[in-house]
């Protein structure tokens, strides 16, 4: 009874819930549950019976494999799904699939919290803002990743001439998607002066974005 599989999928996708092993031979009945007591569908050697539930009309059972197809999953479909098989012998066997449905991450906005000349060095504090999501952050300077210990929503670093980068990219990701945001600086320590700067993010799996100084909320200190 202890088979538990974890699945993570992106919201809006079509999902197949199935087990990695073969079903018991000539089983008598098969049931899929949402949580522990909500039946979705049951097969009993003659037909599939789809019950009243939030899944009605967007699920399909394959009695041969036991696979359950769910279309257009949403975050509300997060649950442990249970497949119960009643064998010809009278015994039951259960498999559990814990489904996690995640929304694609939104495109982050980079806020310049502080930018300050300090002799030949440049103190920089950037924050990567996305609305209430649990995500991973990766910062890049000219497409080279910063060390792991700097990987959170705020990048705070002192730039010296030898490690100065022109563009800073924040990549936010969860297990189903990732998006990037980028800001560029002009040496030694100012925002890029062009009114509009085209930043290519193709190498980081993002998209091209037209960014202007006016788009950036920042405190600019000299």
């Amino acid at each position: 009874q202890g088979h538990l599989v974890h699945m993570t999928v992106v919201s809006g996708s079509n999902v197949t819930l199935n087990i990695s092993e073969s079903l018991p031979e000539n089983y008598k009945q098969l049931t899929w549950f949402y949580t522990f007591d909500q039946k979705i569908v049951e097969w009993d050697s003659r037909k599939s019976k789809y019950f009243e539930s939030k899944f009605k009309g967007r699920v399909r059972l394959d009695p041969q494999s036991g696979a359950l197809y769910i279309s257009k999953v949403q975050k509300e479909d997060n649950s442990t799904y249970i497949m119960r098989v009643l064998k010809k012998t009278g015994n039951e066997q259960e498999w559990k699939i814990k489904l996690q449905v995640l929304d694609p991450v939104p495109k982050p906005v980079i806020k310049i919290e502080k930018i300050e000349d300090m002799d030949d060095n440049c103190y920089l504090k950037l924050s990567c803002v996305i609305p209430g999501e649990s995500v991973n952050y990766t910062w890049y300077g000219d497409k080279r990743p910063f060390p792991k210990e700097l990987q959170n929503s705020v990048l705070e670093t002192t730039l010296m001439p030898h490690n100065y980068s022109r563009c800073y990219t924040c990549q936010v990701s969860n297990s189903v998607s990732s998006k990037n945001g980028t800001v560029c600086l002009s040496p030694p320590c100012t925002l890029a002066r062009s009114e509009q700067k085209l930043i290519s993010e193709e190498d980081l799996g993002g998209e091209q974005k037209l960014i202007s100084e006016e788009d950036l909320h920042h405190h600019h200190h000299h």
Partner: antibody
Framework: QVQLVQSGAEVKKPGAAVKVSCKAS????????ISWVRQAPGQGLEWMGW????????NNAQKFQGRVTMTTDTSSSTAYMELRSLGSDDTAVYYC??????????????WGQGTLVTVSS | DIQMTQSPSSVSASVGDRVTITCRAS??????LAWSQQKPGKAPKALIY???SLQSGVPSRFSGSGSGTDFTLTISSLQPEDFATYYC?????????FGQGTKLEIK
């Protein structure tokens, strides 16, 4: 939580019919079958028959064939058992019980509280 | 019809005792067997299904075993609330049939 609530006690004359109801709550009614079981005073349990709440399929014990009718009303999540041509030996407590499956498996996981039917002239 | 025979028909025991009730089917029923408990004036309560699977919410002191024709229900350490009548029932084929019951009494 799952509940099966049965109708109240009945007193019937020999030859009459009785209809016992079993109202289900706390689960999707059509996803399970209902069996009917009776128990005469001081005696053991006797299975009478089964009905699928999904499609109305039934299977009755031979002993009650032609005398018992089992039905469901999905709009009210209620199962009914009607027993006709009552005799004194039909005096018993009648129970409904939920089957774990929509097609009968014979495994009952929840029982109603019982309905006493007394047949007396 | 499949006949189900329980033994003993009654048994006296004390709190804390280990009790075993047996059930024999008149033909092979594989694991298609259930056990239920009934207290006076109350509806039966499901304990075990598929010969050895514990019904949800039933204490683990109850266990079932066997297959084919011979089955047992064991209560590992009797509690005061366990004194009742126990029934086995075959689910192998229609008509489903019950054993005659085993009454468990306080010694």
């Amino acid at each position: 939580q799952v509940q099966l609530v049965q109708s109240g006690a009945e007193v019937k004359k020999p030859g009459a019919a009785v209809k016992v109801s079993c109202k289900a709550s706390g689960y999707t009614f059509t996803a399970y079958g209902i069996s009917w079981v009776r128990q005469a005073p001081g005696q053991g349990l006797e299975w009478m028959g089964w009905i699928s709440a999904y499609d109305g399929d039934t299977n009755n014990a031979q002993k009650f064939q032609g005398r018992v009718t089992m039905t469901t009303d999905t709009s009210s999540s209620t199962a009914y058992m009607e027993l006709r041509s009552l005799g004194s030996d039909d005096t018993a407590v009648y129970y409904c019980a939920r089957d774990r499956y929509s097609s009968s498996s014979g495994y009952f996981d929840y029982w109603g509280q019982g309905t006493l039917v007394t047949v007396s002239s | 019809d499949i006949q189900m025979t329980q033994s003993p028909s009654s048994v006296s025991a004390s709190v804390g005792d280990r009790v075993t009730i047996t059930c024999r089917a008149s033909q092979d029923i594989s694991s298609w067997l259930a056990w239920s408990q009934q207290k006076p004036g109350k509806a039966p309560k499901a304990l075990i299904y598929a010969a050895s699977s514990l019904q949800s919410g039933v204490p683990s002191r109850f266990s079932g075993s066997g297959s084919g024709t011979d089955f047992t229900l064991t209560i590992s350490s009797l509690q005061p609330e366990d004194f009742a009548t126990y029934y086995c029932q075959q689910a192998n084929s229609f008509p489903y049939t019950f054993g005659q019951g085993t009454k468990l009494e306080i010694k």
